[in-house]
Amino acid sequence: AWELTILHTNDVHSRLEQTSEDSSKCVNASRCMGGVARLFTKVQQIRRAEPNVLLLDAGDQYQGTIWFTVYKGAEVAHFMNALRYDAMALGNHEFDNGVEGLIEPLLKEAKFPILSANIKAKGPLASQISGLYLPYKVLPVGDEVVGIVGYTSKETPFLSNPGTNLVFEDEITALQPEVDKLKTLNVNKIIALGHSGFEMDKLIAQKVRGVDVVVGGHSNTFLYTGNPPSKEVPAGKYPFIVTSDDGRKVPVVQAYAFGKYLGYLKIEFDERGNVISSHGNPILLNSSIPEDPSIKADINKWRIKLDNYSTQELGKTIVYLDGSSQSCRFRECNMGNLICDAMINNNLRHTDEMFWNHVSMCILNGGGIRSPIDERNNGTITWENLAAVLPFGGTFDLVQLKGSTLKKAFEHSVHRYGQSTGEFLQVGGIHVVYDLSRKPGDRVVKLDVLCTKCRVPSYDPLKMDEVYKVILPNFLANGGDGFQMIKDELLRHDSGDQDINVVSTYISKMKVIYPAVEGRIKFSTGSH
């Protein structure tokens, strides 16, 4: 028998520095977790103790904090090289700055292979990107070799900016021939490493002949065997065992997100490359694990540029940006309109001639807007200003919901109106009229939504049975502020870009902004 230790991360999302327990900014260092310096300590400890170790990343290193905003992926290559990752799969967020924003900082600078079998380049890009990412990689591990095949969510064109010269194929269809190639090379230990979410990970384990282990990402799935060490609730045991169509037991793993845990899986193979046993658990990277001093020193060196960036002007406002709770929790506020407009702008993807865009709607809990911005400071808007408005380090995500769920959400928005509660919704691409004289649960008297399958966008009444795409904060997608119906009834959820980054990019693009209160949210009494 031959034993392999797989260490794995996924959806790190720019958390290079240690974070608080909820993966936001570290406040009390004695309680902080994760970060590359702490990760390195644990990885090195395992490498010294065990003979055959692979360190793998299942994608979405990009996007999530000011580190990515400033360094644009150079930080990912630098610190992943320093940690000596053995391979990485491309995630959807790796395309957030377009293909060039992937090629230059990461693909050309990584000293390890970057993989995806289901992304095919065409046209002029094919020769430019050739060899910079691979469908599979054979890695030497001790006296053996291990094959790694990569995959990426085929929804990436809707979630990021891969351009028109990359084709995202069905994962299972694309993976099978690559696994078959590995088999012809007499590689009999094969790991599928990818970024399509836990449901697809399980399907790959079931359907792709020859895959021995699946290491996934995208869905931030936390798996654990036994008593979990922090706040995350396990979606199943670690590893999650799938019985393949040809009768094999295939372990599937994922390690939550944000570098909070290091996935740790031990696999025993027989001489024919069959999995005999698999066991392990994610390791919580808490403060009991010291940060490596040399990596920490490097982090501090890179940090200097971030502090300078946060006080630089992004753009100007010529109007007061009303982000006060007195406005945003009671009525339409222009800060809410600005943020929603930025959210939609960030999700412009012309992927189908029939649609001017794939999504037109935004909802945003008023309680998530934490500060106004005064225009009487020469109109200057900085990252620091935006961090006061959006201090929680969330993301603006894409969900699919039925019209009936949206109607419930808008009823919830005003079910206890007048108490300055955070659930009052700010909107984009939506016109809502409330009648507060009616009883809670029956106060939405008009709800019109902007069409997407149209050449001239216009507002049409919401249809209860229709499925709509909506951009909203991850806080709402997870049922925050009492929006349980969103969490319970959503049909799809893909995590998006860092909230501050979305707004800062929009302001930089527009240069001068002047959002108005324009009748998106109205109140009426009487006959409707």
Epitope: K108, A110, P113, G131, L134, V138, V145
Partner: nanobody, 124 residues
């Protein structure tokens, strides 16, 4: 476009020397482990030598130890194979190959990019 081009092959007498070069274009060679392989007619391709991208450590097949030396010049984006005390059994097509990773290997399966090869003939 990632490309590797070998040169320096030729006809040499037993006991003689040759220096093979492998020039890379389209990528930075210092990010890659580089290996030299050879294939004699009717035989399997065999690993001759490789050099690490991280610390410059070198590895040799037993059959060439003490006679062949691999080196790299990252500034010139080139890897060399100095072959001394050549024997008739060294006759083969010599290929250079490259892959990104941390662990040098003489296993051909781990290499992603290959040159077209240069013929080395050792004969009197």
């Amino acid at each position: 476009q990632v490309q590797l081009v070998e040169s320096g092959g030729g006809l040499v007498q037993p006991g003689g020397s040759l220096r093979l070069s492998c020039a890379a274009s389209g990528f930075t060679l210092d990010y890659y482990n580089i290996g030299w392989f050879r294939q004699a007619p009717g035989k399997e391709r065999e690993g001759v030598s490789c050099i690490s991208n991280s610390d410059g450590s070198t590895y040799y097949a037993d059959s060439v130890k003490g006679r062949f030396t691999i080196s790299r010049d990252n500034a010139k984006n080139t890897v060399y194979l100095q072959m001394n005390s050549l024997k008739p059994e060294d006759t083969a097509v010599y290929y250079c190959a490259a892959y990104r990773g941390w662990h040098p290997s003489l296993d051909a399966r781990v290499y992603d990019y290959w040159g077209q090869g240069t013929q080395v003939t050792v004969s009197s």
